[in-house]
Interface confidence: low
C-alpha cells in the first residue's frame, strides 16, 4: 500500500491511505461534475444581448448594475460576469450591493446602488467633443444626479419565473441557441423588467474526451452531473462522449444522486473541484478532488489530482488494480 501511494504521489496523485487505494479498482461508475472538472472552470462572457428599452437601461448601465451584483457572488459564472463588466466599463470600482441572496442552481437577487460614479467616468463617446473632458479624460458627472437603487435578479429561466417575470419565446429561443453550443445563458431583470441575456462559455478540457473514452473501455460507466440546464449539459456531454447526464441538479441534491447509484449496488467515484460538490465527494465511495479546487474539496476527498489532469482518474484506477494484485 505504501509503495502504491508513493508511486501515485510521484505521479501527482495524492491517495489518502490504503482504503481509497483498495477501493479504486472496484469503481464501476465515475461521476464527473461539469464546471471546473470536465471544463476549465474559467468561463468567459460570449455575448450580452439587451432585451429592454435601451433608452432607460443602456448597455453601460446594465453592465454597471450586473457587475456590481455579481461581484458578491462566489460562483465561477458570477466571477466571469464581473470581470467582463469591469473590463467593458474600464473600471475596477463598482457600486454597492445590499440584500444579496444567492439561490444555488437558480440565481442571485440583490439591491444595487451608487453606480452613477462608474457611469460618469465612462470612456468618451465618439460624439463627445474633447473639450468637454475633465482631467481624467472622462465626461463630467451629471449635476444633481439622484442616486438610484436598482432591484436586480440574475439567473436561469426558472429563477426569473419564480420571481414573477414572463420570458417570451424569442428570448427563450435566443438562450437555446447558446445552450445548444454548450454555453450557459442567464437572464437579467432590473426593477422587475427583463432587460438582458448573458451567454457564458467554459471550454472543455483537452483531455476530457480521452479520459471518458478510456474509462468506458475499462467497463466503467461515466456520468456527468451539473446544475446547468439540460441543453447545455447535453451539449458538453456530447463533446466528451458521455451518454448519461444528470442536469439541473441543485448542489444539495448531488449527494442524493451519488446515493441513488450506490443504492443500486454500484461503487461510485465522484470527481469535482469542490465548488458546490464537497458533500458529494465525501459521500462517494471514492471522492476525487481536482488539485486546483477548494480547500474543502481537498479535505473531503480520498484522492487529490495535483496536476488537474483528468487522465489521472484513469491512472489512479489502474494503479489500484496493480497494487491490489500485488497485495494478493
Amino acid at each position: 500500500v505504501m509503495v502504491g501511494t508513493g508511486v501515485a504521489a510521484q505521479n501527482g496523485i495524492l491517495i489518502k491511505g490504503g482504503k481509497p487505494l483498495e477501493m479504486a479498482h472496484k469503481i464501476k461508475t465515475v461521476m464527473f461534475d461539469k464546471t471546473g472538472t470536465i471544463t476549465h472552470g474559467v468561463p468567459r462572457v460570449m455575448r450580452v444581448l439587451l432585451l429592454g428599452d435601451v433608452a432607460t437601461l443602456p448597455l453601460r448601465k446594465v453592465l454597471a448594475v450586473v457587475g456590481t451584483a455579481e461581484a458578491s457572488s462566489e460562483h465561477p459564472l458570477g466571477v466571469a460576469v464581473t470581470k467582463y463588466c469591469k473590463e467593458e466599463l474600464g473600471t475596477e470600482t463598482l457600486g454597492y450591493c445590499t440584500d444579496f441572496q444567492a439561490v444555488p442552481g437558480c440565481g442571485i437577487g440583490c439591491k444595487v446602488s451608487n453606480v452613477e460614479g462608474i457611469l460618469a467616468h465612462s470612456e468618451r463617446p465618439l460624439s463627445a467633443p474633447a473639450s468637454h473632458l475633465n482631467e481624467a479624460g472622462s465626461l463630467p458627472a451629471e449635476k444633481d444626479a439622484v442616486p438610484q437603487t436598482f432591484s436586480v435578479l440574475i439567473g436561469n429561466r426558472e429563477w426569473l419565473r419564480r420571481n414573477g417575470l414572463t420570458i417570451s419565446s424569442d428570448v427563450s429561443d435566443a438562450m437555446t441557441d447558446h445552450e445548444m453550443k454548450g454555453q450557459t445563458a442567464i437572464l437579467v431583470a432590473i426593477d422587475g423588467v427583463l432587460c438582458g441575456m448573458i451567454a457564458i462559455a467554459d471550454a472543455v478540457k483537452q483531455e476530457a474526451a480521452l479520459a471518458v473514452h478510456t474509462l468506458q473501455s475499462m467497463g466503467v460507466d461515466v456520468v456527468l452531473i451539473t446544475g446547468d440546464n439540460r441543453k447545455t449539459a447535453r451539449a458538453i456531454a456530447t463533446q466528451v462522449g458521455i451518454n448519461k447526464v444528470f442536469a439541473e441538479v441543485l448542489p444539495s441534491h448531488k449527494v442524493a444522486k451519488v446515493q441513488e447509484l450506490q443504492n443500486k449496488g454500484k461503487k461510485v467515484a465522484m470527481v469535482g473541484d469542490g465548488v458546490n460538490d464537497s458533500p458529494a465527494l465525501a459521500q462517494a465511495d471514492m471522492g476525487v478532488a481536482i488539485g486546483t479546487g477548494t480547500d474543502v474539496a481537498i479535505e473531503a476527498a480520498d484522492v487529490v489530482l495535483i496536476r488537474n489532469d483528468l487522465l489521472d482518474v484513469v491512472a489512479s484506477i489502474h494503479l489500484s488494480k496493480r497494487t491490489v494484485r500485488r497485495i494478493r
Epitope: 439587451l50 435601451v54 443602456p58 448597455l59 453601460r60 474600464g90 465612462s122 470612456e123 463617446p125 465618439l126
Partner: antibody, heavy 115, light 110 residues
C-alpha cells in the same frame, strides 16, 4: 493614430508578426481589432485585444494567430501561413461598452504568402 | 452574428439617391451596435455612421443611417462622384464568433 508594420513576403508554412503602434490614446481604455482584406475581397475580422489584455478571436483562427500587447503596441503573430493568408492587414480602434465601432484605422500592411 | 448586405453592385447617377441594406442575424447588441464604413480602392476604411444612425465627425449629412435590431439601411442622397466606393456595415466585435463585417456593397457613380 495607428500604424501597422512588419508586412512582407513569406513562404507557405512560415511565421510572421505584424505590429500596430498607437499614439494619441491609451490602450488601457480601448480595444484594438485586427482585420484583413484579401485582394479584391471584403473585410474579415481576425480578433480583438481588450483593455486588460484579454484576446478574442474569430472561429477560423484555431490557434494559428495570437494577439499580444504592450503599452503602445499590439502584435499579431501568425504561424502556419498559407497562400490564403495573403492580404492587407489592418488594425483599428474600437470603443468600450457604450460603443463598439471602429473609429480609427491604420493604413494597413501587406502580407504576401508565396513560394 | 452574420451581416448580409444587399444589393451589390449598385449604380447611381450624380445627384441621385442610393440605398444599401444590411440585415443582421441575430439582432445586433443593444439593438443599435451597427456602423457603416466607406472604403475606396487602396485606402483604409473610413467610419461614416455609428450607433446605426449617428453621423461620424466630418461626414456630410448626405449620408444617413437608419434601422434597429436586425434591419439597417444606409442612404446616400445627392450622390457625388466622390461617393464611388465599397460600403460595409459592421456589428460588434466582442460578441462575434464570426465576421462582424457585412460582405460589402460597391457603389458605382455614373
Amino acid at each position: 493614430s495607428l500604424e501597422e508594420s512588419g508586412g512582407r513576403l513569406v513562404t507557405p508554412g512560415g511565421s510572421l508578426t505584424v505590429t500596430c503602434t498607437v499614439s494619441g490614446f491609451s490602450l488601457s481604455s480601448y480595444w484594438i481589432i485586427w482585420v484583413r482584406q484579401a485582394p479584391g475581397e471584403g473585410l474579415e475580422w481576425i480578433g480583438s485585444s481588450g483593455p486588460s489584455g484579454s484576446a478574442y478571436y474569430t472561429s477560423w483562427v484555431k490557434g494559428r494567430f495570437t494577439i499580444s500587447k504592450t503599452s503602445t503596441t499590439v502584435d499579431l503573430k501568425m504561424t502556419g501561413l498559407t497562400t490564403e493568408d495573403t492580404a492587407t492587414y489592418f488594425c483599428a480602434r474600437a470603443g468600450g461598452s457604450d460603443y463598439d465601432w471602429f473609429d480609427l484605422w491604420g493604413q494597413g500592411t501587406l502580407v504576401t504568402v508565396s513560394s | 452574428q452574420v451581416l448580409t448586405q444587399t444589393p451589390s453592385p449598385v449604380s447611381a447617377a450624380v445627384g441621385g439617391t442610393v440605398t444599401i441594406n444590411c440585415q443582421s442575424s441575430p439582432s445586433v447588441a443593444n439593438n443599435n451596435w451597427l456602423s457603416w464604413f466607406q472604403q475606396k480602392p487602396g485606402q483604409r476604411p473610413k467610419l461614416l455612421i455609428y450607433g446605426a444612425s449617428t453621423l461620424a465627425s466630418g461626414v456630410p449629412s448626405r449620408f444617413k443611417g437608419s434601422g434597429s435590431g436586425t434591419q439597417f439601411t444606409l442612404t446616400i442622397s445627392d450622390v457625388q462622384c466622390d461617393d464611388a466606393a465599397t460600403y460595409y456595415c459592421a456589428g460588434g466585435h466582442k460578441t462575434a464568433e464570426k465576421n462582424p463585417f457585412g460582405g460589402g456593397t460597391e457603389v458605382v457613380v455614373k
